[in-house]
Amino acid sequence: MACLGFQRHKAQLNLATRTWPCTLLFFLLFIPVFCKAMHVAQPAVVLASSRGIASFVCEYASPGKATEVRVTVLRQADSQVTEVCAATYMMGNELTFLDDSICTGTSSGNQVNLTIQGLRAMDTGLYICKVELMYPPPYYLGIGNGTQIYVIDPEPCPDSDFLLWILAAVSSGLFFYSFLLTAVSLSKMLKKRSPLTTGVYVKMPPTEPECEKQFQPYFIPIN
């Protein structure tokens, strides 16, 4: 099918007969006709979550009545621009990215809520929202100023096997330490209970007569 031309709308205006309030109203109403650029707004800075997820809103002021819109997320680093993800949607329908895309999003009127997943510290950079009104003609391009996304990698979780080894080492250490402490304490106690004597026991009078028992003196040799 051959290309179709563009529809042009030319307002035939005669302002000479208009009063000042009408002229002012006219210019307020028709500014969008003369200023045909499409403006895109997005936040200046966004901090990604600890799980590497960043979300931001991309809003555009449409100069035309588009039925098909394409939204692209671009990453700019050192004047190099690369495409992160892109989705085309019909106005009123849901925004759908490809299955393998790192982006997800929802659309509501002239506003798109974008979420980028799987980000790492090395992905920190300027993310530009590009909006294109694809159909019907004329085509319009809108480029945002970009959102600086900061990604901070979380502290890496140690390996579970490594953790077990640490746990085993610490508990073993504590066990041997307590064992040593017990041994030292016992030896000290034994030394206190056995003073160096000649080994002669003398029969002592009982403290309570009713419990009196007969004891024969005996000798304990001391080595």
């Epitope: 290309c3 650029a37 495409e83 085309t88």
Partner: antibody, heavy 118, light 108 residues
Framework: QVQLVESGGGVVQPGRSLRLSCAAS????????MHWVRQAPGKGLEWVAV????????HCADSVKGRFTISRDNSKNTLYLQMNSLRAEDTAVYYC???????????WGQGTLVTVSS | EIVLTQSPGTLSLSPGERATLSCRAS???????LAWYQQKPGQAPRLLIY???SRATGIPDRFSGSGSGTDFTLTISRLEPEDFAVYYC?????????FGPGTKVDIK
């Protein structure tokens, strides 16, 4: 690096047809809008047509509407311009151009000359 | 459609001089969507400036762009022998994508 090579130009009689091709390499073809721009001998640049991304949308200049058809084959990294009902005023060098991700025309082919003459 | 007009049509200068080229739009063009190209005889155009003021990769810093709304300027601070060529402005914010008629910079 990015390379665009046009072919298919030549001398053709008014009312006849011609098909131009543009072989692209060095970039992800499907991520870019691809344009045709022409330049009549000794004249300025005139935008002819664009085909976007997956090929579902195209736009053309009024001067070629109904006569020229732009198409692309992303599997072959190739852009086409089917020119029917050619006129003398279509005589020009036709350039295949890549529309950069931010919209400007960053890479141009060397051009192919189309001469419409009886 | 947005009509672009360029002035002057021809600019005759000597190497080392400053060149100032003007581009005017029939309606407001966002500065994000205005580009300048250089074309030498027998060659394809080459991108110089995009977004009204950003230099393309490999373009010397003697080339600079400025302007907003309907008035844009390309300045070549000191003309080098290789700068004598035709310069085109272009808007790429909406279709049809239009070019100015060009300004020829030739040696005086």
């Amino acid at each position: 690096q990015v390379q665009l090579v046009e072919s298919g130009g030549g001398v053709v009689q008014p009312g006849r047809s011609l098909r131009l091709s543009c072989a692209a390499s060095g970039f992800t073809f499907s991520s870019y809008g691809m344009h045709w721009v022409r330049q009549a001998p000794g004249k300025g640049l005139e935008w002819v047509a664009v085909m976007w991304y997956d090929g579902s949308n195209k736009h053309c200049a009024d001067s070629v509407k109904g006569r020229f058809t732009i198409s692309r084959d992303n599997s072959k990294n190739t852009l086409y311009l089917q020119m029917n009902s050619l006129r003398a005023e279509d005589t020009a060098v036709y350039y295949c151009v890549r529309g950069e991700l931010l919209g400007y025309f960053d890479n141009w082919g060397q051009g192919t000359l189309v001469t419409v003459s009886s | 459609e947005i009509v672009l007009t360029q002035s002057p049509g021809t600019l005759s200068l000597s190497p080392g001089e400053r060149a100032t080229l003007s581009c005017r739009a029939s309606q407001s063009v966002s500065s994000s969507y205005l580009a300048w190209y250089q074309q030498k005889p027998g060659q394809a155009p080459r991108l110089l400036i995009y977004g009204a003021s950003s230099r393309a990769t490999g373009i010397p810093d003697r080339f600079s762009g400025s302007g907003s709304g309907t008035d844009f300027t390309l300045t070549i601070s000191r003309l080098e022998p290789e700068d004598f060529a035709v310069y085109y402005c272009q808007q790429y914010g909406s279709s049809p994508f239009t070019f100015g008629p060009g300004t020829k910079v030739d040696i005086k």
